[in-house]
């Protein structure tokens, strides 16, 4: 039960995280005009990964796409790449984790296969989250660098009379969405990896003892009860009989490891 909950929660958290990464990638507010120097501007500028926008005080908003690839800063291209890789990995991870969910039965898929899929999706979520966090952090670093560079030459005098105010940009809402979303995806991935440990068949749940009978080969399993593990394995102490029968809601099915004489 605990494994199913951990896996389900990991899936939901990752789903929210990936939705957030997609939202952040699409948002226009990666950088917004710093209003510290001009809090009463009638023209507000903000920029995203794909286009830059201007909102006038009337409400009129005009956005222009970056219709060039070669002319864009390498850092921006890198951020785009990181975010896209994060989305792609996250999407694949979601697809894999759907089939890995304990509550979903697909044919006679073994728990070991589900465990492997859970681990795979967990790793994908972790990498996806790291990509998003890295992308957002690279962009934020770029903003900080440009901010202080533009502060250094904030005003360029023209004949001592005219001032040209340089537009400075600060962190936009998309950065915070990206950081939170990346964090959630990362947490979801970790949860999936933890759930995988509970799903995986354990090597030695019990010791099989072999008895050498004179006439027939008989294997006897002492105890009759499966040992309880820390990851939700048979907490109800259901009796496991020699015939190999398993109750349907049992958490794990173990391969038989007996010495036959």
């Amino acid at each position: 039960m605990a494994v199913t909950a951990c896996q389900g929660l990991g899936f939901v958290v990752s789903l929210i995280g990936i939705a957030g990464i997609i939202a952040a990638t699409c948002m226009d507010q990666w950088s917004t005009q710093d209003l510290y120097n001009n809090p009463v501007t009638a023209v507000f500028n903000y920029q995203g990964l794909w286009r830059s926008c201007v909102r006038e005080s009337s409400g009129f908003t005009e956005c222009r796409g970056y219709f060039t690839l070669l002319g864009l800063p390498a850092m921006l291209q890198a951020v785009r790449a990181l975010m896209i890789v994060g989305i792609v990995l996250g999407a694949i991870g979601l697809l894999v984790s759907i089939f890995a969910l304990k509550c979903i039965r697909i044919g006679s898929m073994e728990d070991s296969a589900k465990a492997n899929m859970t681990l795979t999706s967990g790793i994908m979520f972790i990498v996806s989250g790291l990509c998003a966090i890295a992308g957002v952090s690279v962009f934020a670093n770029m903003l900080v660098t440009n901010f202080w560079m533009s502060t250094a030459n904030m005003y360029t005098g023209m004949g001592g009379m005219v001032q040209t105010v340089q537009t400075r940009y600060t962190f936009g809402a998309a950065l915070f969405v990206g950081w939170v979303a990346g964090g959630l995806t990362l947490i979801g991935g970790v949860m999936m990896c933890i759930a995988c440990r509970g799903l995986a068949p354990e090597e030695t749940n019990y010791k099989a003892v072999s008895y050498h009978a004179s006439g027939h080969s008989v294997a006897y399993k002492p105890g009759g009860f499966k040992a309880s593990t820390g990851f939700g394995s048979n907490t109800k102490n259901k009796k496991i009989y020699d015939g190999g029968a398993r109750t349907e809601d049992e958490v794990q099915s173990y391969p038989s490891k007996h010495d036959y004489v």
Partner: antibody, heavy 119, light 113 residues
């Protein structure tokens, strides 16, 4: 046809108060920002205040800050300018103007209402 | 606040001739985000409210005759009337539309010579 009609002007003593109104028609009032601009007799134009379509934020010229308040009632298609602590230099024709959708400009103006501050 | 300075204060031009009015701002009105200049031109005829002529420094308002044109960028702007008509006699104002408080130039009175 877009129409803006100002009212509420008149003679007032220094330190007194006055409330100007601007009745709008011919357009969807609630979707446009609105300005107040004044013109002293024989002088140039002076922008006074602006209120966005959503009633916030609002802006004022430095000379009227703390004395004038701008408000609007979208249900009544009306714009208001509450003027307190009036001074002689506030004497002017007050125009209400609609903010154009483009360029932060003012595309339609009322005929104006005269405010005279004198003892 | 951005200070708007218009020149000349008054201008007399013959009918059919070109009239040029200048406007200078104390700060650049060019917005880097969209490369637009936030300068507006208005015309005010005697006894009437102002009328919008040009916004974004060079975009004519609908209904404004094409003899009116605006140019310039950054801090220096020009309103040109290519062929003066009798009905163009008015006072012309430039306005900063870039940051609050919006400020107007002192106005240029255009007359017929």
């Amino acid at each position: 046809e877009v129409q803006l009609v100002e009212s509420g002007g008149g003679l007032v003593q220094p330190g007194g108060s006055l409330r100007l109104s601007c009745a709008a028609s011919g357009f969807t009032f609630s979707t446009f920002g609105m300005h107040w601009v004044r013109q002293a007799p024989g002088k140039g134009l002076e922008w006074v205040s602006y209120i966005t379509s959503g009633e916030s934020p609002i802006y004022f010229t430095d000379t009227v800050k703390g004395r004038f308040t701008i408000s609007r009632d979208n249900a009544k298609n009306s714009l208001y300018l509450q003027m307190n602590s009036l001074r002689a230099e506030d004497t002017a024709v007050y125009y209400c103007a609609r903010s154009s959708y483009y360029g932060n400009s003012m595309d339609y103006w009322g005929q104006g209402t005269l405010v005279t501050v004198s003892s | 606040d951005i200070v708007m300075t218009q020149s000349p204060d008054s201008l007399a031009v013959s009918l059919g001739e070109r009239a040029t009015i200048n406007c200078r701002s104390s700060q650049s009105l060019l917005n880097a985000g969209n490369r637009k200049n936030y300068l507006t031109w208005y015309q005010q005829k005697p006894g009437q409210p102002p009328k919008l002529l040009i916004y974004w420094a060079s975009t004519r308002e609908s209904g404004v005759p094409d003899r009116f044109s605006g140019s310039g960028s950054g801090t220096d702007f020009t309103l040109t009337i290519s062929s003066l008509q009798a009905e163009d006699v008015a006072v012309y104002y430039c306005q900063n539309a870039y940051s609050y408080p919006f400020t107007f130039g002192g106005g240029t009175k255009l007359e017929i010579k």
